[in-house]
Interface confidence: medium
Amino acid sequence: GSERTCCPVNWVEHERSCYWFSRSGKAWADADNYCRLEDAHLVVVTSWEEQKFVQHHIGPVNTWMGLHDQNGPWKWVDGTDYETGFKNWRPEQPDDWYGHGLGGGEDCAHFTDDGRWNDDVCQRPYRWVCETELDKASQEPPLL
């Protein structure tokens, strides 16, 4: 495929990545699928600078990111190493809380109203952010 050189319409470019901010809410898995269909992934936050950029755009609204522990350890959807990477959890989070009465714990991470992260029930219909890297090859066939 050819390399993507500019962001699609209605996406925001920042530091060689393109970001798309949802206006509606979906469960984490549906949000994850939406981004994949756009040849992107749920946002992966790798620095304080990127955290501030995303936070500025989403405002004080619960918003899914590409981080989950549905299979045990916390994992970023693009394979970025969680243990050595950037983290911005709220105090005492993640806590895998079971007291919500919805069954199971809390396996998906989201930005909270102040930008810090919390783990929550993956079925909650939060907004989400998709991200794709400008330097990666797109899935479209090259023009002949």
């Epitope: 925001v12 809410g25 755009h57 405002g59 004080p60």
Partner: antibody, heavy 118, light 106 residues
């Protein structure tokens, strides 16, 4: 200090046009989401129009096809072009800064009055 | 469109007393609700966002509560500068406002 100052209001006949301005200081208009909100006399507030950082614009159904929001980055100013004005457009028009794309409005101007009457 | 309904339309309270303002949405807005204060001749001021979080420099006497469709703004001890019009706003789906509650001196 963040400040928003609206201007351009006045008395206009039905069917006429008017352009409102909102001069911003203390922050950069182009790197923020910005909205116009109006308040008819003795009534509540109604969101009218928004412009995103990338330039995309969206309008409330009540003004669709008649009102256009825009900005001049060099002047750090927000505009609302109002065409085909109706009596029901009579209101105080406020510009406001959105806190994020879909958050609340964290700063407001003091408003400019638009009166549509023959 | 999500319709926001505020009650009462007018609230008469003595200085130092407590005021409770109600806001109801026609469908769930989760906690994506804000409260604003409008004083005559002044710009609107954001008081509360996220249903219960005080905005910067807002005094502790202003408290928001609720989630889903039912919300309350409580002013614990009314000061002279608190007599004003208060609006709730949902930002779960675009933006819509209530019609406002006027808090007047009794």
């Amino acid at each position: 200090e963040v400040q928003l100052v609206e201007s351009g209001g006045g008395l206009i006949q039905p069917g006429g046009s008017l352009r409102l301005s909102c001069a911003a200081s203390g922050f950069t208009v182009s790197s923020n989401y910005m909205s116009w909100v109006r308040q008819a006399p003795g009534k509540g507030l109604e969101w009218v129009s928004v412009i995103y950082t990338g330039g995309s614009t969206y309008n409330a159904d009540s003004v669709k096809g008649r009102f256009t929001i825009s900005r001049d980055n060099s002047k750090n100013t927000l505009y609302l072009q109002m065409n085909s004005l109706r009596a029901e457009d009579t209101a105080v028009y406020y510009c406001a800064r959105n806190w994020g794309m879909a958050g609340p409005f964290d700063y407001w101007g003091q408003g400019t009055l638009v009166t549509v009457s023959s | 469109e999500i319709v926001m309904t505020q009650s009462p339309a007018t609230l008469s309270v003595s200085p130092g007393e407590r005021a409770s303002l109600s806001c109801r949405s026609s469908q769930s807005v989760n906690s994506n609700l804000a409260w604003y204060q409008q004083r005559p001749g002044q710009a609107l001021r954001l008081l509360i966002y996220g249903a219960s979080i005080r905005a910067t420099d807002i005094p502790a006497r202003f408290n928001g509560s609720g989630s889903g469709t039912e919300f309350t703004l409580t002013i614990s001890s009314l000061q002279s500068e608190d007599f004003a019009v208060y609006f709730c706003q949902q930002y779960n789906n675009w933006w819509t406002f209530g019609q406002g509650t006027t808090v007047e001196i009794k």
